[in-house]
């Protein structure tokens, strides 16, 4: 079984489906946000370019105890070819500013929607 985004499926999930599901989850997070997401936790912002999925996971995986983003963390791991652990930052990850998780999610969502519209599913 292939497990992506926490859902078991009979075969590999098409990249377009996986990206759409990730977008839907981020939309769900932003729309259901009442109190500050993850209680205002701050994470490193990322360059939304090559290696974006791993960089996003590297940033968000450091936040623990925030159930609202646990599914997103699992889904991002399906897009990242290597295992990511808390405190791990690749050379692609430039640590220049921290932003609230809520802003991180909004920025990521906008970029993923753009990629989806342009047919860039990987």
């Amino acid at each position: 079984l292939t497990c992506l985004g926490g859902f078991a499926s009979p075969g590999p999930v098409p990249p377009s489906t996986a990206l759409r599901e990730l977008i839907e989850e981020l939309v769900n997070i932003t729309q259901n946000q009442k109190a500050p997401l993850c209680n205002g936790s701050m994470v490193w912002s990322i360059n939304l370019t090559a290696g974006m999925y791993c960089a996003a996971l590297e940033s968000l995986i450091n936040v623990s105890g925030c159930s609202a983003i646990e599914k997103t963390q699992r889904m991002l791991s399906g897009f990242c070819p290597h295992k990511v652990s808390a405190g791990q930052f690749s050379s692609l990850h430039v640590r220049d500013t921290k932003i609230e998780v809520a802003q991180f999610v909004k920025d990521l969502l906008l970029h993923l929607k753009k990629l989806f519209r342009e047919g860039q599913f990987n």
């Epitope: 993850c38 209680n39 205002g40 936790s41 701050m42 994470v43 450091n62 936040v63 623990s64 105890g65």
Partner: nanobody, 116 residues
Framework: GVQLLESGGGLVQPGGSLRLSCVAS????????MDWVRQAPGKGLEWVST????????YYADSVKGRFTISRDNSKNTLYLQMNSLRAEDTAVYYC?????????WGPGTLVTVSS
């Protein structure tokens, strides 16, 4: 649990200096990445600076680069922020935070007012 207590804030004239301190308890301080975050009156949270556990890595927001210096003394479980060349726009409540934790685990903050 995590406890953080900031001190060192106050009223200072533009161009002046202050040194903020934050005493930490309830967690293993020397392996924790630590942040300074601020909130200006009526504004949102703004990240100021981060220091890695080993003190090897220090990171700053563009708005404070070259003026502020973050440091830590792991033997005293204390985080510092040396603020020089202060400007009116640095007026804010400054919070010390264990990185990646929510506001419920931050300290109460210390108010810095820069005014002539």
């Amino acid at each position: 649990g995590v406890q953080l207590l900031e001190s060192g804030g106050g009223l200072v004239q533009p161009g002046g200096s202050l040194r903020l301190s934050c005493v930490a308890s309830g967690f293993t301080f020397d392996v924790a990445e630590m942040d300074w975050v601020r909130q200006a009156p009526g504004k949102g949270l703004e990240w100021v600076s981060t220091i890695s556990p080993s003190r090897r890595g220090t990171y700053y927001a563009d708005s404070v680069k070259g003026r502020f210096t973050i440091s830590r003394d792991n033997s005293k479980n204390t985080l510092y922020l040396q603020m020089n060349s202060l400007r009116a726009e640095d007026t804010a409540v400054y919070y010390c935070a264990k990185a990646y934790t929510g506001r419920s685990l931050w300290g109460p903050g210390t108010l810095v007012t820069v005014s002539s």
